[in-house]
């Protein structure tokens, strides 16, 4: 990947990722330098007859660093702080080739929950106020609410009226997704409104 256009690579928090390195065809490589945010990560000297010399220069990532046979960088147990700019410089007798990468760490979505603040009106119409959430949501998480295949909301919140006298049993499903995972959680309008009705009746007695 040329230095002008970094290759963007997605990694998943806690998992492993490989930054692929392509060698100049038919040229003998003198050494390879890997950098993270312009700070040296590792210095590799390949040998034709024996194992390469690998000098890891960043102790912070050192234990989680590995290199493939083609000197691609492998980073395991990914952390959010691994996000950033990586560069590999391959030096041959005649030239230096630069490869650039941008590593983005994404979280697998976890623990989807729906909270309900619903109310019952005197005409027995139930107004549902539902809020969907996931653990550690960021701006890359997309939320939507669906019912019978139709999108009713494109936000974590859904406000909808449900009338038990004219509406059949209805499930509302929150879907949360990002580039690496998706979760869903369904709630029953009938059940939620029955709960509200019980509370409403209790307060009247």
């Amino acid at each position: 990947q040329s230095s002008l256009t970094p290759l963007m690579v997605n990694g998943i928090l806690g998992e492993s990722v490989t930054l692929p390195l392509e060698f100049p065809a038919g040229e003998k490589v003198n050494f390879i330098t890997w950098l993270f945010n312009e700070t040296s990560l590792a210095f590799i000297v390949p040998h034709e007859t024996k194992s390469p010399e690998i000098h890891v220069t960043n102790p912070k990532q050192g234990k989680r660093l590995n290199f493939t046979q083609s000197y691609s960088l492998q980073l395991s147990n990914l952390k959010m702080e691994d996000t950033g700019s990586y560069r590999a410089q391959i030096s041959t007798k005649t030239s230096a080739k630069l490869s650039s990468y941008t590593l983005r760490i994404l979280r697998q979505l976890r623990n989807i929950q729906v909270t309900n603040h619903s109310q019952l009106f005197q005409n027995m119409t139930c107004e549902l106020h539902l809020t969907c959430s996931v653990e550690d949501a960021d701006d890359n998480v997309s939320f939507r609410w669906e019912a019978l295949g139709n999108t009713l909301s494109s936000q974590p919140n859904l406000t909808v009226s449900w009338d038990p006298r004219i509406s059949s049993e209805q499930d509302y499903t929150c879907i949360a997704e990002n580039a690496v995972s998706n979760l869903s959680f369904s709630v029953s309008a009938q059940k939620l409104c029955e709960d509200v009705k019980i509370q409403y009746t209790d307060t009247k007695m």
């Epitope: 690579v9 669906e146 909301s153 494109s154 936000q155 919140n157 406000t159 580039a179």
Partner: antibody
Framework: QIQLVQSGSELKKPGASVKVSCKAS????????MNWVRQAPGQDLKWMGW????????RYADDFKGRFVFSLDKSVNTAYLQISSLKAEDTAVYYC???????????WGQGTTVTVSS | QIVLSQSPATLSLSPGERATLSCRAS?????MHWYQQKPGQAPRPWIY???NLASGIPARFSGSGSGTDYTLTISSLEPEDFAVYYC?????????FGGGTKVEIK
């Protein structure tokens, strides 16, 4: 039917401010996020950010942090884009667009042309 | 941010011909959306989530792809199809659009 109607064209001097409105009708306004997209003359589309129409919380793309403000008036189902300290490079068509989910913009306003010229 | 590169920039074809528009992302994305824009008009939703046609879009249009490579195909061009088509990704903020492919009459 579902539609977004934007305010009319604006001609402003550098340093002035402008407020573009986007009135929604035909759907529950607070259930769908509202996005803003800029298209400079002869240029591509550029996403400026969005506002959560339920909570009123705005999110701005990096290039639009500072002079750009998204706001709402839920009582009249209207989203607003305000730009302060206008520059010549702000000359563009500004679109509001409803997010149907997964940032798919299924309904667009007709666009508001903002021209900044001395 | 994820950069979307559309190719070709301009496609010169005759009515009845097949058009293939490409959109390549700088990083893997989950899905791609497509919009059509004609001069002086707002963009119109065309294809969502890679392969689903927006309401009222004729079946001669189709979308496909995964990862970093996505395609919009028009099986047989009609006069009203000549326009600019933009791809857009949603997997990462900021949401980004491609530079557009202009489909023009040859």
């Amino acid at each position: 039917q579902i539609q977004l109607v934007q305010s009319g064209s604006e001609l402003k001097k550098p340093g002035a401010s402008v407020k573009v409105s986007c009135k929604a009708s035909g759907y529950t306004f607070t259930n769908y996020g509202m996005n803003w997209v800029r298209q400079a003359p002869g240029q591509d589309l550029k996403w400026m950010g969005w506002i959560n129409t339920y909570s009123g919380e705005p999110r701005y793309a990096d290039d639009f942090k500072g002079r750009f403000v998204f706001s709402l008036d839920k009582s009249v189902n209207t989203a607003y884009l305000q730009i302060s300290s206008l520059k010549a490079e702000d000359t563009a068509v500004y679109y509001c667009a409803r997010d149907y989910g997964r940032w798919y913009f299924d309904v667009w306003g007709q666009g508001t042309t903002v021209t900044v010229s001395s | 941010q994820i950069v979307l590169s559309q190719s070709p920039a301009t496609l010169s074809l005759s009515p009845g011909e097949r058009a293939t528009l490409s959109c390549r992302a700088s990083s893997s994305v989950s899905h791609m959306h497509w919009y059509q824009q004609k001069p002086g008009q707002a963009p119109r939703p065309w294809i969502y989530a890679t392969s689903n046609l927006a309401s009222g879009i004729p079946a001669r249009f189709s979308g496909s792809g995964s990862g970093t490579d996505y395609t919009l195909t028009i099986s047989s061009l009609e006069p009203e199809d000549f326009a600019v088509y933009y791809c857009q990704q949603w997997s990462s903020t900021p949401r980004t659009f491609g530079g557009g492919t202009k489909v023009e009459i040859k």
